[in-house]
Amino acid sequence: TGADTEAVVCAGTACYTAHWGKLSAAEAQNLCLQNGGNLATVKSEEEAQHVQQVLAQLLRREAALTARMGKFWIGLQREKGKCLDPSLPLKGFSWVGGGEDTPYSNWHKELRNSCISKRCVSLLLDLSQPLLPGRLPKWSEGPCGSPGSPGSNIEGFVCKFSFKGMCRPLALGGPGQVTYTTPFQTTSSSLEAVPFASAANVACGEGDKDDSQSHYFLCKEKAPDVFDWGSSGPLCVSPKYGCNFNNGGCHQDCFEGGDGSFLCGCRPGFRLLDDLVTCASRNPCSSSPCRGGATCIPGPHGKNYTCRCPQGYQLDSSQLDCVDVDECQDSPCAQECVNTPGSFRCECWVGYEPGGPGEGACQDVDECALGRSPCAQGCTNTEGSFHCSCEEGYVLAGEDGTQCQDVDECVGPGGPLCDSLCFNTQGSFRCGCLPGWVLAPNGVSCAMGPVSLGPPSGPPDEEYKGEREGSTVPPAATASPTRGPEGTPKSTPTTRRPLLSSDAPITSVPLEVLAPSGSPGLWREPSIHHTTAASGAQEPAGGDSSVATQNDDGTDGQK
């Protein structure tokens, strides 16, 4: 193909080519791929304009515009089995060359959901109208076509080729012709930017004369991010024209010598670069273009500048101002992250403290450690917390569940623990008998003994030492179901074990049960009380009969 027979637009770091061809999306993608590109992305309005420009070039080359709609494939596709996502700008579609989802979209109409087949996107053009800059082509979604059956109204496709940088077009200081050959095998004489690794053939002269010189240059990286041809001075200069032809090929000023020679120069504040044609600002930062704490960094050789932000800040969309980075978005902390201007800090949840491996790590606080336990009795550390427990005969109490309160086993929810009298003690209880009865060896039952009018008998102190079992009780429980009365030998089974589960019914015991039949009944009426299972609060039982209780101090009745 001759120069300018192909539609190509280069801008930024990419070139776009537009092609006629009734092909399926897969066939079009393969053609782009063969030259090192992909079907075009349209990730921003700016990119949409570049794509529109290249399509406009293509349409200008089509002699007869027909009154019909035409579609051109771009690189937006949705795989089979992937459903429409109306909440996203790309609706679940993605760019074939990869890359992130982008906020820009320009859908032609509301999409219908279909997950059963692959779907592809094309640009919808009215081929009878010239493309207007303000009206960017709409996106149309449909089947992707197959070889020989591209789909309705498919007329062509747009490719995109990305590059690390671009060279400026070569400046001619006299008559001549430049032909650029790009890495994607397109030739052109009119590129506004020429991609890295392109070749430029320069043929100087009027074309019909034999005195033509030719030059060959490559667009290459001369220094980091500096792309240039390596030519020095304007090309094809002629004394016949001096500065009159294309300003001598100079970027700014052209100065003629008396002998027909000329030199390029620059305006104040600019300097001439090594190519002896182009001017660059002496100090692009002199106008203080950066704001908000951003530092201006001049580019190499005085070309352009970049604003750089202090740590913890990033450039905003203008690329001139600094805004705080929300480091917490990257979840740098193990637990809580608090964003601060220019930084962030990690915090730990209650029950944790800073420490452990890694930045922002938290480790469990051992609330039960020596000297810091909040519990009155037993303390068990857990991940991020702790729980208190009580020894046998005590239950958890207090608003925060750290205190232990004695269980009055004599009013336990399971009914009487003793056959006759019950004496509550700190953390335990003892059984006793009415006058004339003695406590049996099991420590619970009463047996007929010598008649006595003294106080009710209990286990002799020297025989029964008040001991606890020593095991703790789970916080929910109030006592262990295997507990016997204080002083009961563990090997000796008690005749009656109390029901102590929290949901055990409270049963009233007839008064007769307290003493074996035939008991002389010579004793003072004890205060009768019982507890409710739910609250543990002691209430007068009115006339209800219950186990007679007596306190350890010898006083009878309620505590």
């Epitope: 490559l218 290459k220 980091p224 390596g230 960094i297 580019g299 190499p300 500048y305 970049t306």
Partner: antibody
């Protein structure tokens, strides 16, 4: 593998010229900058200049402007440095070095010793 | 031209211990693209120089990970964590940000 093979040592008289060579193998010769680095006896390294064999584009260290001409022959993958108007200051070892895509000088020739003496 | 300053000799080091070599530049080597164009080369006695570190902190192919480099835009340090006998030679820092490329004067690593 990448190799840069330089020509042998040279003993030349003051005022004369010398042309030393560097034959590259193991990579696309036309697509990488080829640098020349000078090292005087017991001294440090000085960048002399470079050539892009693809189109013959050259850059020189201003300090040595006019001292050398760099050329390259793509057909034989060989780069040349011609030194002119030699003085004792030009006595040194000259290394040819490939410049890679990270702007590092990653492969070095073994060096060519040039001695200028009457 | 960008000028760099290097001490001619390092403090003598014992084999197996760490060594540091520093280099200071007259201009920041941090490019607007975020890359720092600093390089380290080692020239062992009687040999051609070899690339150790490229773009400030990247280890060149075949270089042991005992070598590391860090720094700001103008001040840089090459660190060898466990010096071995084969590490002796002259260490050069260099910049490839702007033409002409320039090298530091070199620092000779000395073993006790």
């Amino acid at each position: 593998q990448v190799q840069l093979q330089q020509s042998g040592p040279e003993l030349v008289k003051p005022g004369a010229s010398v042309k030393i060579s560097c034959k590259a193998s193991g990579y696309a010769f036309s697509s990488y900058w080829l640098n020349w680095v000078k090292q005087r006896p017991g001294k440090g390294l000085e960048w002399f200049g470079r050539i892009y064999p693809g189109d013959g584009d050259t850059d020189y260290n201003g300090k040595f402007k006019g001292k050398a001409t760099l050329t390259a022959d793509k057909s034989s993958s060989t780069a040349y440095m011609q030194l002119r108007s030699l003085t004792s200051e030009d006595s040194a070892v000259y290394f040819c070095v490939r410049g890679d895509g990270y702007w590092a000088m990653d492969y070095w020739g073994q060096g060519t010793s040039v001695t200028v003496s009457s | 031209d960008i000028v760099m300053t290097q001490a001619a000799f390092s403090n003598p080091v014992t084999l197996g211990t760490s060594a540091s070599i520093s280099c200071r530049f007259s201009k920041s080597l941090l490019h607007s693209n975020g890359i720092t164009y600093l390089y380290w080369y080692l020239q062992k006695p009687g040999q051609s120089p070899q690339l150790l570190i490229y773009q400030m902190s990247n280890l060149a192919s075949g270089v042991p990970d005992r070598f590391s480099s860090s720094g700001s835009g103008t001040d840089f340090t090459l660190r060898i964590s466990r010096v071995e006998a084969e590490d002796v030679g002259v260490y050069y820092c260099a910049q490839n940000l702007e033409l002409p490329w320039t090298f530091g004067g070199g620092t000779k690593l000395e073993i006790k």
